[in-house]
Interface confidence: low
């Protein structure tokens, strides 16, 4: 059961697993959200009845019943974790806490104009937990402004203290606003020789990575596969450090596998899904509950929809015993992870999906391409959005992509003669603009935010929001695209695809059937000599043959220019502009959506 | 109750490495924690040499980074100290202590160990 | 690194006497600061912590205060088992660092 109000002046009696130490109960909710055992939660705050050394304590519970019984005391604040519910979660924090030290190790001091400032700087140091900012009114002339950069162990605050004049708040890396690198690639052959901060029990170097990547203290890790010579370290992976934030030394080691925290990207890759299943491999923990189940997939599901537990083992059946079901079993660990990895015993082991919630909607993976053609098929671009006006009569107006479940990203030139949302409606969900009838559903659009820079398509800023009156409930057919990570800059898109119901040539008309082409990126340079009349900027982002021949075309403005890349979709470009259509040597110009990030952030997260 | 006892050897010669191990008793390193080294040259003060927590991160104090070491070992529940190019100036009683609380912050040393006098001569 | 300078270096009070040792921050260290009892032959022990909270067992004569860069340490009334040599430590920045010491003696 899912509750998601706090209970005041209540305590949860017994079931401590730690403590820690939040600003705040809403954040303590969040830190038990994200532990892999807690359920329940209560949290002490500031109170003139209460000793100030429990001020801002977060007392992490657990319960096989998951409930505690309840006692009251003022200032404590109690409630549930959202590992119950089903809605979306985040870790993201962007609150600023005045008059509240947060300590932790203070690794790093300067001087910042603003609390804003250092929070950017924490949010770009890959060591950067959260901070404390002495304002320009602290007591201690030589220490205002002071910015003191924070790290624990834990990723939250090792005590928290009241001090007049100070703030505090946490990176913002959770928040996809880091401009670290994100290292992708998992070194084969390698083993990094650096302090390990911790080590846990993994299948594979891919699921190593992942919990790397949701581990506070975690910079980069080492897994030993199955392979490995030395039996008693097969599975392991290694968390580890290192005060560069870069491995010191990589040794050639056969067998085990290297790579890096993917924090700064985490908001476009999945992080604490773990989807994949184990064949003849065997899941060590606790056991919560042994039951019968048809097939593994059906095991997945019950390990799903039990809170607690978080990995299973699938004894398939022997023969026609039990109705051909085999045994499910349930189980848990201290940190969410096996105890130990056994392989050939004829088990199909994997992870709860229940965490899948906490990794954005937009990294689910959706159906397989189809390969070939150029119209598409239900479902395969579930993020395009086409964008009608109804006045003077109602007609497809642009395209738009789906990147939050209020929000289409679309062009600002869709706008031009726009006088009032109240004339657009959005549809989701649609392959053929035949579907769409006098009661086909859509959603109204409360507000449109076009980039206040924007003038004209060719000269940039080609960008906007269209805020909707009602929330999006995603579903094969509609669910939202990855907005690229700041970290991933330098990759090199191979995948990239265009999509719209716009013209297929220039003298032409609005297609019925949304059509898709894949589509090479130009570099910037290749796309100034084309483009000798323009200026080509590192906001905009060129796709197109040389010898011409595809194409986004008049229709497909503000739709998307998709890529994927490591089995994830990016919103790479938006529709923008070109000379033409499909002409050699004219690639199509598209909003470099990257350059934007931060500004969509800051208009989507607004409160 | 939680216990520390220092051992290493008492005389080491000049160039070479000061090892020394810090055995903890009533309490598992695993559990968590930082456990640090602290030395006291005869009649002088006490200097912060480096801790370490239960999974290996180590801080040290960068006067003597380049030289020391600090490991720990959970399955025999001990850490130890190496500090290498030793000279007269590192003649001191080698402390090995337990911080205050178990997160992670270097706040205050609790509980100490009796202290080892380490001699470098040759 | 965060210089802690502390004074005086000695001092002989009679017992009953009032006991003050000052300790200086090179820069503001909030509360950060600890302070430690060493005894002849012995290991230091932890009396105050947060510059003014007394450690579990410490009598309750050991007191202390101050913020930013400037710290006292009191005994409000000396008593023969009180001589020992006291330390300040501060934890706001690593490299953690001590105080000089005040070796306390009775006249």
């Known amino acids: 059961e899912c509750v998601t109000q706090l209970l005041k002046d209540t305590c949860f009696e017994g079931g401590d697993i730690t403590t820690v130490f939040t600003p705040s109960a809403k954040y303590c909710q969040v830190v038990c959200t994200y532990h892999p055992r807690c359920l329940l939660f209560t949290f002490t705050a500031e109170s003139p009845s209460e000793d100030p050394t429990r001020w801002f304590t977060c007392v992490l519970k657990d319960s096989v019943t998951e409930t505690l019984p309840r006692v009251n005391r003022t200032a404590a604040i109690s409630g549930y974790s959202f590992k119950q519910c089903s809605h979306q979660i985040s870790a993201c924090n962007k609150d600023i806490y005045v008059d509240l030290d947060m300590k932790g190790i203070n690794y790093n001091s300067s001087v910042a104009k603003s609390a804003q400032e250092c929070q950017e700087r924490c949010t770009d140091d890959v060591h950067c937990h959260f901070f404390t900012y002495a304002t320009r009114q602290f007591p201690s002339l030589e220490h205002r402004n002071i910015c003191l950069l924070k790290h624990t162990q834990t990723g939250t605050p090792t005590r928290i203290t009241k001090l007049d004049k100070v703030v505090s708040g946490f990176s913002l890396k959770s928040c996809a606003l880091s401009n670290l690198a994100c290292i992708r690639d998992i070194f084969p052959n390698t083993v990094f020789a650096d302090s390990n901060i911790d080590s846990v029990m993994a299948p594979d170097a891919f699921v190593c990575g992942r919990i790397c990547t949701h581990h506070p203290g975690c910079l980069f890790f080492t897994f030993f596969s199955q392979e490995w010579p030395k039996e008693s370290q097969r599975n392991l992976c290694l968390l580890k450090t290192s005060e560069s934030g870069l491995p010191s030394t990589r040794i050639k080691k056969s067998k085990a596998l290297s790579g890096f925290s993917l924090q700064s990207c985490r908001h476009s890759i999945p992080v604490f899904c773990h989807s994949s299943f184990y064949h003849d491999t065997d899941f060590l923990g606790e056991e919560l509950d042994i039951v019968a189940a048809k097939s593994h997939e059906a095991c997945q599901k019950l390990c799903t929809n039990a809170v607690r537990c978080q990995f299973f083992t699938y004894t398939p059946a022997q023969a026609s015993c039990n109705e051909g079901k085999g045994k499910c079993y349930l189980k848990l660990s201290s940190n969410g992870s096996p105890t130990k990895i056994l392989h050939g015993r004829g088990g199909i082991s994997g992870y709860t999906l229940r965490l899948c919630k906490m990794d954005n909607e937009c990294t689910t993976k959706i159906k397989p391409r189809i390969v070939g053609g150029t119209a598409s098929v239900r479902g395969e671009w579930p993020w395009q959005v086409t964008l009608h006006t109804t006045s003077p009569t109602q007609r497809h107006l642009c395209g738009g992509s789906i990147i939050g479940n209020q929000w289409i990203l679309t062009a600002a030139h869709c706008f031009y003669g726009v006088e009032s949302p109240k004339i657009l409606r959005v549809y989701s969900g649609i392959l053929n603009q035949s579907e769409i009838k006098e009661d086909t559903s859509f959603f109204g659009v409360q507000e449109i935010i076009i980039h206040d820079q924007y003038k004209m398509a060719e000269s940039g800023y080609d960008i906007a929001l269209l805020k909707l009156e009602t929330t999006v409930n995603y579903t094969d057919s509609q669910r939202p695209i990855c907005l690229p990570s700041k970290g991933d800059r330098n990759v090199i898109y191979t995948d990239c695809w265009v999509t719209g119901w716009g013209y297929r040539k220039l003298r032409d008309k609005i297609q019925n059937t949304l059509q898709k082409a894949k589509i090479p990126l130009v570099t910037n340079e290749e796309c100034q000599k084309r483009y000798r009349g323009h200026k080509i900027t590192h906001k905009m982002i060129c796709a197109g043959y040389r010898e011409g021949g595809k194409d986004a075309c008049k229709g497909d403005s503000g739709g998307p220019l998709s890529c994927k890349h490591n089995e994830v979709w990016h919103l790479v470009g938006i529709t923008s502009w070109g000379e033409g259509c499909a002409q050699r040597e004219r690639p199509g110009v598209y909003t470099n959506v990257v350059e934007y990030v931060d500004w969509i952030l800051e208009k989507t997260q607004a409160v | 109750e939680v216990q520390l006892q220092e051992s290493g050897p008492g005389l080491v010669k000049p160039s070479e490495t000061l090892s020394l191990t810090c055995a903890v008793s009533?309490?598992?390193?695993?559990?968590?924690?930082?456990w640090g080294w602290i030395r006291q040259p005869p009649g002088k003060g006490l200097e912060w040499i480096g801790s370490?927590?239960?999974?290996?991160?180590?801080y040290y104090n960068p006067s003597l980074k380049s030289r020391v070491t600090i490991s720990v070992d959970t399955s025999k529940n001990q850490f130890s100290l190496k500090l290498s190019s030793v000279t007269a100036a590192d003649t001191a009683v080698y402390y090995c202590?337990?911080?205050?609380?178990?997160?992670?912050?270097?706040?205050?040393?609790?509980?100490w160990g009796q202290g080892t006098l380490v001699t470098v001569s040759s | 690194d965060i210089q802690m300078t502390q004074s005086p270096s000695s001092l002989s009070a009679s017992v009953g006497d009032r006991v003050t040792i000052t300790c200086q921050a090179s820069?503001?260290?909030?509360?950060?600061l600890n302070w430690y009892q060493q005894k002849p032959g012995k290991a230091p022990k932890l009396l105050i912590y947060?510059?003014?909270n007394l450690e579990t067992g410490v009598p309750s004569r050991f007191s202390g205060s101050g913020s930013g860069t400037d710290f006292t340490f009191t005994i409000s009334s000396l008593q023969p088992e009180d001589i020992a040599t006291y330390y300040c430590?501060?934890?706001?920045?690593?490299?953690?660092?001590f105080g000089g010491g005040t070796k306390v003696e009775i006249k």
């Open positions: 202590a337990r911080d205050r609380t178990t997160v992670s912050m270097i706040e205050y040393f609790q509980h």
């Open positions: 009533g309490y598992s390193i695993s559990s968590g924690y930082f």
């Open positions: 370490i927590l239960h999974s290996g991160v180590t």
């Open positions: 820069q503001d260290i909030s509360n950060y």
């Open positions: 947060d510059a003014s």
């Open positions: 430590q501060q934890f706001h920045l690593l490299p953690i660092t």
